[in-house]
């Protein structure tokens, strides 16, 4: 068990001409709130996929009012971190959705508003109990910059958050066979109480002899990969029982990292992430010094001057991990903007821009008006050498070609369903309620339970609201 | 979180008139739909009035012509004007809040209006 923590650190123009217009306004003051939603692994999900590893809510941020005439700045921010609660192992890989929501405050007709501002989103790696990892991610023209980190809460330790701790039982030293539990060196790791031969890559347990596996891996010790299709014909008489081809064993099984690595398949083979002051193809090479010349790609070693004491290696730009023996993928990040091609070229990076757009991160769009019609009826309009649409009612998105859901904030209260209407929305509400968005129960105590509302209410009745 | 402090109640003749008032402690009252109810001895809490952050109004029935509900958000304040009073609108009179920030509903303490000759 454990929490992922992200922090938001600005949200604003990005850099390059075409700046977004502010949110919000001297008629429409607004606040920012953040929703995350994290998946595990790194599959490419749709937005609306549930959010498996869990998903958290900002407090709302202070009013915001535009100034006049000023360029729309870093916008005023919700205090504290987001917070997302895991109950299992953290997964290492994982996808996560950022979204940054816009709440009008307005007196404006249908009272407050939300509206999504932005959507970012990315598959990362990610190891429980690492330091903060930074990020900037683009949507359009807005740029949010934050950081995460994954921390397990004891006694779990460990890149996974399997390992568990206990205090120390003599004062001086752990146990045969058991390490100190960095970085609570007061505590012992506990000894393993998994089945035995449970996989350590791919099961964890958090009762003594059970093996539970991560997503992904399946069987009693969690070392047969879950097939991604569904078998049809069975091969030889070995699999009649199931009619499926029974995978071989994967590179990570019975895991070849030592010393506390963890496993990773690559295509040809297999990789082992190190615990610091361990490197080799296995981390089999231990006692390593800032003599040993353990940083890679021009890193910088400092401390380590004995084997007790562990370095570490300042990496230059464009590596990372432990040792620097990782090469940033810094089009992960996705710089290119309006749909530009990643290229990194080592030295560099390069955006191949999608026609009609140029510029070092194809931020230009070239086309501005011309040529480029809003959809459904929305008029464009032109500015700083990019277009925009104005959108008629009922349709939003860059070219109007997204129908804009008034239903999707939730608008009516107490279970009472919302219908969008081409003027607005109606709230059809439960026996019991009633007000134009079911705010108001007839009979507080048991307003669920009524079967109808007195003569003259309806609460059943859509109210609308517009 | 949200507090309800009503004032206005008292006693009143059959036909006269009472306005009743309720201060919100809340920074954003224009987030929240507001409403008054009342309970008479030995009856349920019932609706009497409510008007929505977007400044719909409902009634119930009994008191449609008599009663008026209104809000002004710069005074963080929502009253209900009663005339015509009559014996059966006797009750204590609640000051009913729902926020549509934390989506939940707050009441106030009550005041006591007694129409009686």
């Known amino acids: 068990a454990g929490v992922f923590e992200l922090q938001i650190h600005s949200f604003g123009p990005g850099p390059g001409p075409g700046a977004p217009r502010s949110p919000c306004s001297a008629r429409l003051p607004c606040r920012l709130f953040f929703r995350v939603c994290l998946k595990p692994g790194l599959s490419e999900e749709a937005a609306e996929s549930p959010c498996a590893l869990g998903a958290a809510l900002s407090a709302r941020g202070p009013v915001y009012t535009e100034q006049p005439g000023a360029p729309a700045p870093d916008l005023p921010l919700p205090d504290g971190l987001l917070q997302v609660p895991f109950r299992d192992a953290w997964p290492g890989t994982f996808s996560f959705i950022i979204e940054t929501w816009r709440e009008e405050l307005g007196d404006q007709i249908g009272g407050p508003a939300w509206s999504l501002l932005a959507r970012v989103a990315g598959r990362r790696r990610l190891a429980a109990g690492g330091p903060w990892a930074r990020d900037i991610q683009r949507a359009g023209a807005w740029e949010l910059r934050f950081s995460y980190r994954a921390r397990c809460e004891p006694p779990a330790v460990g890149t996974a958050c399997t390992r568990l701790c206990r205090p120390r039982s003599a004062p001086s030293r752990c146990g045969p066979g058991l390490r100190p539990c960095a970085p609570l060196e007061d505590e012992c790791e506990a000894p393993l109480v998994c089945r035995a031969g449970c996989s350590p890559e791919h099961g964890f347990c958090e009762q003594p002899g059970e093996c539970r596996c991560l997503e992904g891996w399946t069987g009693p010790l969690c070392t047969v990969p879950v097939s991604t299709s569904s078998c049809l014909s069975p091969r030889g008489p070995s699999s009649a029982t199931t009619g499926c081809l029974v995978p071989g064993p994967g590179p990570c099984d019975g895991n070849p990292c030592a010393n506390g690595g963890s496993c990773s398949e690559t295509p040809r083979s297999f990789e082992c992430t190190c615990p610091r002051g361990f490197y080799g193809l296995r981390c089999e090479v231990s006692g390593v010094t800032c003599a040993d010349g353990p940083c890679f790609n021009g890193g910088l070693c400092v401390g380590g001057a004995d084997p007790d004491s562990a370095y570490i290696c300042h990496c230059p730009p464009g590596f990372q991990g432990s040792n620097c023996e990782k090469r940033v993928d810094r089009c992960s990040l996705q710089p290119c903007r309006n749909g530009g091609l990643c290229l990194d070229l080592g030295h560099a990076l390069r955006c191949r821009c999608r026609a009609g757009f140029a510029g070092p991160r194809c931020e230009h769009d070239l086309d501005d008006c011309a040529g480029r019609a809003c959809a459904n009826g929305g008029t464009c309009v032109e500015g700083g050498g990019a277009h925009r649409c104005s959108c008629a009612l009922g349709f939003g998105g860059r070219d109007c070609r997204e129908r804009a859901d008034p239903c999707a904030a939730r608008p009516c209260a107490h279970g009472g369903r919302c219908y969008a209407h081409f003027s607005g929305l109606v709230c059809a509400c439960a026996p019991g309620y009633m007000g134009a968005r079911c705010e108001f129960p007839v009979h507080p105590d048991g307003a669920s339970a009524l079967p109808a509302a007195p003569p003259g209410l309806r609460p059943g009745d859509p109210q609308r609201y517009l | 979180e949200v507090q309800l402090v009503e004032s206005g109640g008292g006693l009143v003749q059959p036909g006269g008139s009472l306005t009743l008032s309720c201060a919100a402690s809340?920074?954003?009252?224009?987030?929240?739909?507001l409403a008054w109810y009342r309970q008479a001895p030995g009856k349920k809490r019932e609706l009497v009035a409510g008007?929505?952050?977007?400044?719909?109004?409902v009634y119930m029935d009994s008191v449609k012509g008599r009663f008026t509900i209104s809000r002004d958000n710069a005074k963080n304040s929502v009253y209900l004007q009663m005339n015509s009073l009559r014996a059966e609108d006797t009750a204590v009179y609640y000051c009913?809040?729902?926020?549509?920030?934390?989506?939940?509903?707050?009441w106030g303490q009550g005041t006591l209006v007694t129409v009686s000759s």
């Open positions: 008007i929505s952050d977007d400044g719909s109004i």
């Open positions: 809340s920074s954003s009252v224009s987030l929240l739909s």
């Open positions: 009913y809040a729902y926020s549509w920030i934390t989506r939940s509903p707050y």
